[in-house]
């Protein structure tokens, strides 16, 4: 007779990153008999949901339930009916949630009330919607990464099974850009962190890790944009704005309410004269480099040593994963390779920023000219940001490793959020049987 | 400044109940979504439920639905959660937060179901 084969004692869970431009579902499985072991849980599905980011509804929140239902129906059917009920959902909302909380604790509980309602209505556990904090979205990147790489695994091996990996037990850091915020997270050398708010101290499967963490608010691509903007139209003559970030020949108009209707231009508002201007691409590299270090205060530090706006930041140490749009720019770029030096990835950005607005538009055809336009300015911001920001030279760039995805799991802080939250990271070494959870991050 | 107080919490005997409650202030109560978290030793904390700024609207997660009951008085500015049915597993501390808030801001109150 022919063997049956045993149902897959398996689980599921499901996050939901709830991002300032868009919003991505995940859905995770592991086997429910490992759920202590490292590197046991991976990811089946992303689903990108059509549309902008949650933070974009505060306007027409009934909309909220329509705009969820393609991948929340699509997590209904990757997952096996009987497994529904005792999966988890979680959603995390970040930077563009953490702005609109700041410009209305009101509109953005408004926000989280309709997404709650929207996902209860499905047969999932619902475990919450809330907006996380950027040091959480820092340390569940640099978990997620670090998980992903088999980093906390106590098993050494002469071979390698993931890319990157070093045959040590030293972290990878974790280098996050979003549309709103940054992070940078790492373990440093031996340096003690001199802010208290920028430490992190984790005890994971039986080894203690006291992790730097950084979470820039406005700092991140599309937020950044907003700043340089509001910052060059202090000094425009009129109402035309010729921006070296952009390419020669492009042109577009942009509302004065639209640039100061976010809290990341604050600083530079002011009364002008016109209610809208015209941005008149010029494409010069250097030129836009110079303009984006003007969003970096370097003048002011109360630390042994700083990234930019008197946050302090340890020397930077070992090998970082960049992820999340570090990758998705520099994969658009053809820049991810390790070959590629800093000095090559500065050459490639001048020569494609100089490239006449036409001719971009032909050769990616493909693409939404409202992205297309904007690789310019978002490939010379991860330079700045990166050489400028975070002290990252000519010789370390080697160390940073532009990553998408690790074992076909997406880098970012989803995993690690939902391994924290289903207390699948034990703080001690499991037996080889697990036996009980002890405590977790 | 913002003050969320949580008490009410003790000892209770599986299958017993408890009422804990949350006093708020430093911000207008009857404006924003309310939530209950609880955190067990060992264990990550975890969300419980969530009620909406008028009442009208609650929501719990799987394993506490049809034995906990969130509700809210705006006119005395609490917030409420009726826990019947106790289990061991529900023991834990419980917190309560404003719903836009990223982490809870009170010192919780001890819920221990034991025989």
């Known amino acids: 007779t022919q063997n049956k084969a045993l149902p897959e004692n398996v689980k599921y869970g499901i996050v939901l990153d709830a991002g300032s431009s868009h919003t991505s579902l995940y859905i995770y499985k592991w086997p429910a008999e490992k759920e202590n072991d490292t590197g046991v849980v991976h990811q089946v599905e992303e689903c990108r949901v059509k549309g902008p980011g949650i933070s974009k509804f505060v306007q027409k929140v009934n909309e909220i339930g329509i705009y969820l239902t393609d991948c929340m129906e699509r997590a209904r059917e990757v997952i096996p009916r009987s497994q529904h009920q005792e999966t988890p959902v979680y959603l995390g909302a970040t930077a563009g949630m953490r702005l609109l909380r700041m410009e209305s604790e009101e509109l953005a509980d408004r926000v989280l009330d309709v997404v709650e309602r929207s996902l209860s209505n499905y047969p999932f556990d619902f475990q919450g919607a809330r907006i996380i904090t950027g040091q959480e979205e820092g340390a569940y990147g640099w978990i997620t990464i670090n998980y992903l790489l088999g980093k906390f695994s106590q098993k050494t091996r002469w071979f390698s099974i993931v890319p990157y990996e070093t045959n040590n037990q030293e972290t990878f850091g974790a280098l996050d850009l979003g549309g709103a915020s940054t992070q940078v997270t790492f373990v440093p050398q031996n340096q003690t962190i001199e802010s208290p708010d920028n430490a992190l101290q984790f005890r994971l499967y039986g080894k203690d890790y006291n992790v730097y963490t950084h979470s820039f608010l406005c700092y991140g691509k599309d937020q950044a944009l907003w700043q340089k903007l509001a910052k060059d139209i202090q000094v425009a003559s009129n109402e035309i704005l010729r921006d070296p970030c952009f390419h020669p020949g492009y042109k577009k108009v942009v509302n004065v309410s639209d640039l100061y209707k976010t809290p990341c231009t604050k600083r530079f508002e002011m009364t002008l004269p016109f209610q809208q201007f015209e941005i008149q691409g010029i494409g010069n590299y250097q030129q836009c480099h110079q303009s984006i270090l003007e969003l970096f205060n370097t003048s002011y530090c109360p630390y042994s040593q700083c990234a930019f706006n008197g946050i302090f930041l340890p020397p930077l140490q070992g090998d970082f994963g960049a992820f999340s749009a570090f990758y998705f720019v520099m994969k658009f770029l053809n820049l991810t390779s390790e070959k590629v030096s800093q000095e090559k990835v500065t050459e490639m950005m001048k020569k494609f920023c100089a490239q006449p607005w036409e001719e971009i538009k032909t050769s990616y055809a493909g693409v939404k000219e409202k992205y297309l336009s904007e690789y310019c300015f978002s490939g010379t911001y991860i330079l700045s940001l990166l050489l400028q920001g975070y002290h990252f030279t000519a010789d370390s760039w080697e160390h940073i490793h532009f990553i998408g995805k690790i074992q076909g799991s997406d880098a970012g802080w989803t995993l690690g959020y939902m391994l924290n939250l289903t207390n699948m990271i034990p703080a001690e070494q499991p037996l080889s049987t697990p036996l009980s959870h002890s405590t977790y991050v | 400044e913002v003050q969320l107080v949580e008490s009410g919490g003790g000892l209770v005997q599986p299958g017993g109940s408890l009422r804990l409650s949350c006093a708020a202030s430093?911000?207008?109560?009857?404006?924003?979504?309310m939530s209950w978290y609880r955190q067990a030793p060992g264990k990550a904390r975890e969300w419980v439920g969530s009620?909406?700024?008028?009442?009208?609207?609650?929501t719990y997660q799987n394993s506490v639905k049809g034995r906990f009951t969130i509700s809210r008085d705006n006119s005395k500015n609490t917030l409420y959660l009726q826990m019947n049915s106790l289990r061991a597993e529900d023991t834990a501390v419980y917190y309560c937060?404003?719903?836009?808030?990223?982490?809870?801001r009170g010192q919780g109150t001890l819920v221990t179901v034991s025989s």
């Open positions: 009620i909406s700024a008028s009442g009208d609207y609650t």
């Open positions: 430093g911000f207008t109560f009857s404006n924003l979504g």
């Open positions: 937060t404003r719903r836009v808030d990223s982490y809870p």
